[in-house]
């Protein structure tokens, strides 16, 4: 503790100029004072002034008023500093002396004589209010006042609490009258060292180093750090925790960039054809009669369906066609015959059968021939049986479909996953993307197909914390950490939701 006992001398009266021994001063009593402050004693005794002592210069002769003086010799009030906890009680001895010698340092002069003394014992609380008193004896009267105040930076009822206002990173506060801390605006905590973040700043995902700030932890964004940052490259997806990429409806793949609903999003099939989704970016168009092509964009010739029977030749006309029938046939499609079996109308070894009492006939064709007169070699490709742009090829009595890359099946109707061929070496994981397969490589490998062994493995240094799995080849940083539940951050270094005593840790 640290404080000051202050004694203000106001007036001293010694009208007859007498000493304590009854003698008079010649030419008058040149008066100075000795003050002794000590611990409380029921009966004041001689001995050390345990709380301090002080002397004045000569302040006047016989009777005089003592003026306040703030500096130099003859300072009033008198100051008795102490460096301990103020006990609340004291004993005070004020002696008036006459000196024949030096005015400024009468204490050192020989021949000093006591005029009078007073003793005060009692209790005194720390405070700014002066306690005023007056003491009389037969010859003299002394008016004075006194108080105890704390030294600068000391507070409390016993001046025992040291408090220094400060505004640095070890505290932002002022001192209350009792010595407790009063935080400056924007600061909190036992030492007023914790900033009060922007109102609404997320407790776990945001923090601040100065008031009204909200700095986001890795994986979070927004003014209040309450919006997660999705995985880098996430196209059609969102997140509920950082670095996630949860795909919107109709999208798939690691980055939600694979279109699972190409038909709806792009309407690729033309001319009223039916579109069917078949995997990421895959689709097939089923054409209406009269159309062909991958997107049914090509209109077929009206004669393409070979409407003319019995060897009739077809001629396209606007919105229609016309059949030129060979001799012996008539009708819109040359379907009616004027021939009979007698005319040997069946070619290629076909057998003729009489119909309608011999007025018409029908040919029974041998294998690989068709037509009313068995005049056509069977073309098994005329029905466009191959889907997804496959090429139809006749192979004797049968036909085969030669499929485009990415399709298989008898009619090329099945979409092959690019990953089915297991293109990723060294245990890499395959992802179907629009421009072909992409491989996620295990630690120690890289390259389009994980075929390159990495001399310096980005995962080898163990950059991922808290048991996270490390992958290389997925990001520009050469590694990606897959965090276990309860951890976030690019290296999974931040636990989610620590107790409130950790004001910023996410």
């Amino acid at each position: 503790g640290s404080g000051i006992f202050q004694l203000r001398l106001q007036e001293f009266v010694n009208q007859r100029g007498m000493l304590a021994n009854g003698q008079s001063c010649e030419p008058g009593c040149r008066t100075f004072f000795r003050i002794c402050l000590k611990h409380f004693q029921a009966t004041f005794s001689e001995g050390p002034c345990t709380f301090g002592n002080v002397s004045t210069p000569v302040l006047g002769t016989n009777s005089f008023v003592v003026r306040d003086k703030n500096s130099g010799s003859g300072r009033n009030p008198l100051q008795l500093p102490f460096n301990f906890t103020w006990p609340g009680t004291f004993s005070l001895n004020i002696q008036a002396w006459h000196t024949p010698g030096d005015d400024l340092r009468p204490e050192t002069s020989p021949g000093n004589s006591l005029i009078s003394q007073i003793i005060i014992q009692g209790s005194l609380a720390v405070g700014k209010i002066w306690r005023t008193d007056e003491q009389n004896d037969t010859l003299t009267r002394l008016s004075y006042s006194y108080r105890v105040i704390c030294s600068d930076n000391y507070y409390g009822e016993s001046c025992s609490r040291l408090c220094k206002k400060r505004d640095d990173h070890f505290g932002h506060y002022e001192c209350q009258p009792d010595g407790s801390l009063s935080c400056l605006p924007g600061w909190t905590g036992k030492y007023c060292d914790q900033p009060i973040c922007l109102s609404g700043c997320h407790e776990q995902n945001g923090y601040c180093s100065k008031p009204d700030e909200c700095i986001c932890r890795p994986g979070w964004q927004g003014r209040l750090c309450n919006e997660c940052i999705p995985h880098n490259g996430c196209r059609h997806g969102t997140c509920s925790i950082p670095w996630q990429c949860a795909c919107d409806e109709g999208w798939g793949g690691l980055f939600c960039d694979q279109d699972l609903n190409y038909c709806t999003h792009h309407s690729p099939c033309k001319n009223g054809s039916t579109c069917s989704n078949s995997g990421p970016k895959g689709y097939t168009c089923t054409c209406l009669p009269g159309y062909t092509g991958e997107h049914c964009e090509l209109g077929l010739s009206k004669c393409a369906s070979n409407p003319c029977r019995n060897g009739g030749s077809c001629k396209d006309q606007e919105n229609s066609y016309h059949c030129l029938c060979p001799p012996g046939y008539y009708g819109q499609h040359c379907e009616h015959s004027t021939l009979t079996c007698a005319d040997s109308p069946c070619f290629n070894g076909g057998s003729c059968r009489e119909r309608n009492q011999g007025s018409s006939y029908a040919c029974e064709c041998p294998p690989n021939f068709t037509g009313s007169n068995c005049e056509k070699k069977v073309d098994r490709c005329t029905s466009n049986p191959c889907a997804n742009g496959g090429q139809c090829q006749n192979r004797g009595p049968s036909r085969t479909c030669r499929c485009r890359p990415g399709f298989t099946g008898t009619h090329c109707e099945l979409h092959i996953s690019d990953c089915a061929r297991s293109p990723c070496a060294h245990g890499g994981t395959c992802h179907d993307l629009e421009n072909g397969p992409v491989c996620t490589c295990p630690a120690g490998f890289s390259g389009r197909r994980c075929e390159v062994r990495i001399t310096h493995d980005a995962c080898a240094s163990g950059p991922c914390f808290n048991g996270a799995t490390c992958y290389t080849g997925l990001s520009p940083n050469n590694f990606v950490c897959n965090c276990p539940y309860g951890f976030v951050g690019s290296r999974c270094e931040f636990p989610v939701g620590l107790p409130p005593s950790f004001p910023w840790v996410a």
Partner: antibody, heavy 121, light 107 residues
Framework: EVQLQESGPGLVKPSETLSLTCTVS??????????WGWIRQPPGKGLEWIGD???????YYNPSLKSRVTISVDTSKNQFSLKLSSVTAADTAVYYC?????????????WGQGTLVTVSS | SYELTQPPSVSVSPGQTASITCSGQ??????ASWYQQKPGQSPVLVIY???KRPSGIPERFSGSNSGDTATLTISGTQPMDEADYYC?????????FGGGTKLTVLG
Amino acid sequence: EVQLQESGPGLVKPSETLSLTCTVSGGSISSSSYYWGWIRQPPGKGLEWIGDIYYTGSTYYNPSLKSRVTISVDTSKNQFSLKLSSVTAADTAVYYCARQALAMGGGSDKWGQGTLVTVSS
Amino acid sequence: SYELTQPPSVSVSPGQTASITCSGQRLGDKYASWYQQKPGQSPVLVIYEDSKRPSGIPERFSGSNSGDTATLTISGTQPMDEADYYCQAWDRDTGVFGGGTKLTVLG
């Protein structure tokens, strides 16, 4: 009992970057009661405060070194680090890491044993 | 920049009282700390917040701070107290050390 241990190269070439790490054991660097500081002492000379860091990552640097100093913290490893760039022979010193207590008005109540870093080609 | 000034050396006889001063502008309005450093060893905090002793520091070490001067007092000085002593204070967010005082215990 909390202990601090400095580690890093003892020799650095002029114009290069000095890098030191302080590992804290026996207590958590994530305590809200302390700042973690770096102090250096050139041979035969006095102490010079370099800077400090709170577990949140808030940093404070000596203005005379601010343009060259970076202090960082890794709470998962219970470590904090010092980087001093563009070093010269004048940066040759014993480098100490220390714990600065809020309850002691910023007094450094725990110190590492110090590591001598010499800047020489 | 803020500066703290200490006398380069102070000598004292064993058993006597040693006083080491540290002066700086309005230092009394700041908290002063004192560190003891023996040759080849790390500094040790002996006084913080002007006059408080950390646990384990002998009672003969005391401190005061007012006006422009902080003082470290070692009463009944022992030969083992011979060391360099540094005062330290905070000027805003910057730590400042005094130049250090070598205390020699005579005899």
